[in-house]
């Protein structure tokens, strides 16, 4: 049994890091493998992650972590029974994928203005809380070409757009994702999308 693609890990910089790797053949990850991880820190304890299958030869493990900070560094040991298959390390702050924003809501009752709001996925005491920026994707269910991205570079998790910038009388969907420049993160996954019917009063032509 050998590792074909070494584990690569990403952290949500809060409580979970996800590691994925591939074996050289079909593997029952949960029964045959264990990923041991330990913070390189005084008094830290070793933890064991039981991997799940991710395709025939692929495995994925969700590592639970406490109080993630930039100085943290973890040792990783991948075991098959008594055999050490791979040894490595992982610094969560250098491989951050933020959590997806939640509770995306479209408020359509503000005089011909659409107000989109969502929730910051981090608590205020997490460093990323004040450092997320967002991308909002709006698209038409009827017209695949009607697809737009709004970059929200301020901290407030909201976006106002004129209803008239979208077509009237048709349904739209929106979703939002986040990233943080400070840790050079990847983009989060998209939030679940929300749907609304866009309608507004056309101004009278004189």
């Amino acid at each position: 049994m050998k590792v074909l693609q070494e584990p690569t890990c990403v952290s949500d910089y809060m409580s979970i890091s996800t590691c994925e790797w591939k074996m050289n053949g079909p593997t029952n990850c949960s029964t045959e493998l264990r990923l041991l991880y330990q913070l390189v820190f005084l008094l830290s304890e070793a933890h064991t992650c039981i991997p799940e299958n991710n395709g025939g030869a692929g495995c994925v493990c969700h590592l639970l972590m406490d109080d993630v900070v930039s100085a943290d560094n973890y040792t990783l040991d991948l075991w098959a029974g008594q055999q050490l298959l791979w040894k490595g390390s992982f610094k969560p702050s250098e491989h951050v994928k933020p959590r997806a924003p939640g509770n995306l809501t479209v408020h359509t009752n503000v005089s011909d203005t659409l107000l989109l709001t969502w929730s910051n996925p981090y608590p205020p005491d997490n460093y990323l809380y004040n450092h997320l920026t967002y991308a909002v994707n709006i698209w038409s269910e009827n017209d695949p070409a009607d697809f737009r991205i709004y970059n929200v570079t301020y901290l407030e998790p909201s976006l106002r757009i004129a209803a008239s910038t979208l077509k009237s009388g048709i349904s739209y969907r929106a979703r939002v994702r986040a990233w943080a420049q400070c840790y050079n993160t990847t983009w989060s996954e998209w939030s679940p999308s929300t749907k609304w019917h866009n309608s507004y009063r056309e101004p009278f032509e004189q």
């Epitope: 820190f41 005084l42 008094l43 830290s44 304890e45 406490d66 109080d67 900070v69 930039s70 100085a71 005491d125």
Partner: antibody, heavy 116, light 111 residues
């Protein structure tokens, strides 16, 4: 919000021991290390040691080795710092502080006076 | 005796800028991150800066930190009378044993 509530002031005689408590609330108790530091009157801060509330293991500054003990009670989310063989130079305010590499939140402090 | 040296006192007028240095060595500041704590008279210390230059939520951006080599610096702009306090730097050492030294402390007076 995070709160670290420390026990009240103590007056002790030289040679005695003192046990200071720090009750934590507002966060997952076992997820954060706890430090202890002290400050003698008019002096600076001095680090004493650190405890991992999950397993209960602790490590102490060399200066206090053999004289200090840090423990925890997960059922009450409380950490304790016991200092023995007290001398007058141990008169200080003793602080618990939550954190790992740095101390995010501090208790208000417990004044321990050692006097004959 | 602390291995991190700070000036005993600094002073400046309201609205001015002041800097406080924290000098260490390769085994502490040079190899770790620095944090800064503010201790108002009669109160417990409060975290101002961690990770050399990051501010916890609620700390105004008038406070900033930096590090170069074995020296860290805390800068406070737009000084206010409420900033009058003792300031301590801190770091950690992992050479033979792990320890968390604090700086000697600096008394800031707002004139």
């Amino acid at each position: 919000q995070v709160q670290l509530v420390q026990s009240g002031a103590e007056v002790k005689k030289p040679g005695a021991s003192v046990k200071v408590s720090c009750k934590a609330s507002g966060y997952a108790f076992t997820s954060y290390y706890m430090h202890w530091a002290r400050q003698a009157p008019g002096q600076g801060l001095e680090w004493m040691g650190i405890i991992n509330p999950r397993g209960g293991s602790a490590s102490y500054a060399q200066k206090f080795q053999g004289r200090v003990s840090m423990t925890r009670d997960t059922s009450t989310s409380t950490v304790y710092m016991e200092l023995s063989s007290l001398r007058s130079e141990d008169t200080a305010v003793y602080y618990c502080a939550r954190g790992k590499y740095w101390m995010y939140d501090w208790g208000k402090g417990t004044l321990v006076t050692v006097s004959s | 005796q602390s291995v991190l040296t700070q000036p005993p006192s600094v002073s400046a007028a309201p609205g001015q800028k002041v800097t406080i240095s924290c000098s260490g060595g390769s085994s502490n500041i040079g190899n770790s991150y620095v944090s800064w704590y503010q201790q108002l008279p009669g109160t417990a210390p409060k975290l101002l800066i961690y990770d050399n230059n990051k501010r916890p939520s609620g700390i105004p951006d008038r406070f900033s930190g930096s590090k170069s080599g074995t020296t860290a610096t805390l800068a406070i702009t737009g000084l206010q009378t409420g900033d009058e306090a003792d300031y301590y730097c801190g770091t950690w050492v992992t050479s033979t044993v792990w320890e968390w030294p604090f700086g000697t402390g600096t008394k800031l007076t707002v004139l």
